[in-house]
């Protein structure tokens, strides 16, 4: 039975040209995390595997940095980065947990008003 829950930052905004940290946290389970996938709806961004370490999708190599922890840092943000992001936790023995984050990339002046949604 899957007892765990994924906590995410929910909806966040960031400034065009800046960077943002995507973070999820799996709680309420003793299951072992074997792999975390970071994905958009139709694109794998990165994988953090317990044995293999981090693997960044080659097409995102220049704009994605691993961490902190199991999180993911997106850099040089563009308006096209606006959208849904998913953290997919592969665990044993529970199975797969999926968390959702919505990122809105804003022009500089607008983003300042949304700063409270950014992860510190």
């Amino acid at each position: 039975m899957m007892t765990g829950t994924i906590e995410t930052t929910g909806n966040i905004s960031a400034e065009k040209g800046g960077s943002i940290i995507l973070q999820c946290h799996l709680s309420s389970t003793t299951a072992q995390v074997t792999q975390v996938n970071w994905e958009q709806q139709d694109q794998l961004l990165a994988i953090c595997n317990a044995d293999l370490g981090w693997h960044i999708s080659p097409s995102f190599k220049d704009r994605v940095a691993p961490g902190p922890g199991l999180g993911l840092t997106l850099q040089s943000l563009t308006v096209n980065d606006t959208g849904e992001y998913f953290c997919i936790y592969h665990t044993y023995p529970d199975g797969t947990y999926t968390g959702r984050i919505f990122l809105e990339v804003l022009e500089s002046s607008v983003a300042e008003h949304g700063a409270r949604f950014q992860i510190p």
Epitope: Q35, D42, Q43, L44, L52, P58, S59, I88, T96, T98
Partner: antibody, heavy 121, light 113 residues
Framework: QVQLQQPGAELVKPGASVKMSCKAS????????MHWVKQTPGRGLEWIGA????????SYNQKFKGKATLTADKSSSTAYMQLSSLTSEDSAVYYC??????????????WGAGTTVTVSA | DIVMTQSPDSLAVSLGERATINCKSS????????????LAWYQQKPGQPPKLLIY???TRESGVPDRFSGSGSGTDFTLTISSLQAEDVAVYYC?????????FGGGTKLEIK
């Protein structure tokens, strides 16, 4: 173009070890995971394990832990698999295969031609 | 480990006829959060390594003829060749692309009747 070059055959004696190579070209070696797959007529295709050439991290199928050791040499863009304490059960074709990112998926997109290992006294 | 079971083991189909290969996984390969199925199909001809045909259960690899199609979700999947050609004679494998260890079906040998 992407190529994975493997030696065609290895003949080894029971109890010995063999280290086979997989030389990659046509892409950035450290940006892609490299996997090894065993094929026998009886058991079909079996995933042995994978190596991340960038970090050196390895993941093994529990069945092949202690049998296979995966390494990679970044300077020559070559992945290696060593098989130890060989028996007739290890006679098989061994493939190296790269995983590429296809949308949300990590897929075996390029394969070596395979190395045929024959264990015989 | 996820066990992949293919049926039939072998199949003989007349040229121009439809060929259907089934694959069943012991655990769901669907991530319901993003509605993606982590299943791939490969074709292997004698003396060659496997070649990718389908990924994500239904997406054809670039260059694969449109007579090949994949369908299914969760634990039950199907590879269909709508009109068999002579060059389609091969062994076909499904593969769990969901979690390590990656596992393959036992293969289906497709021949011409």
């Amino acid at each position: 173009q992407v190529q994975l070059q493997q030696p065609g055959a290895e003949l080894v004696k029971p109890g010995a070890s063999v280290k086979m190579s997989c030389k990659a070209s046509g892409y950035a070696f450290t940006n892609y995971l490299m996997h090894w797959v065993k094929q026998t007529p009886g058991r079909g295709l079996e995933w042995i394990g994978a190596i991340n050439p960038g970090s050196g991290g390895t993941s093994y199928n529990q069945k092949f832990k202690g049998k296979a050791t995966l390494t990679a040499d970044k300077s020559s863009s070559t992945a290696y698999m060593q098989l130890s304490s060989l028996t007739s059960e290890d006679s098989a074709v061994y493939y190296c295969a790269r995983t590429g990112v296809y949308g949300n998926f990590l897929i075996f997109d390029y394969w070596g031609a395979g190395t045929t290992v024959t264990v015989s006294a | 480990d996820i066990v992949m079971t293919q049926s039939p083991d072998s199949l003989a189909v007349s040229l121009g006829e439809r060929a259907t290969i089934n694959c069943k996984s012991s655990q769901s390969l669907l991530n319901s959060g993003i509605q993606k199925n982590y299943l791939a199909w490969y074709q292997q001809k004698p003396g060659q390594p496997p070649k990718l045909l389908i990924y994500g259960a239904s997406t054809r690899e670039s260059g694969v003829p449109d007579r090949f199609s994949g369908s299914g979700s969760g634990t039950d999947f199907t590879l269909t060749i709508s009109s068999l050609q002579a060059e389609d004679v091969a062994v076909y494998y499904c593969q769990n692309d969901h979690r390590y260890p990656f596992t393959f079906g036992g293969g289906t040998k497709l021949e011409i009747k």
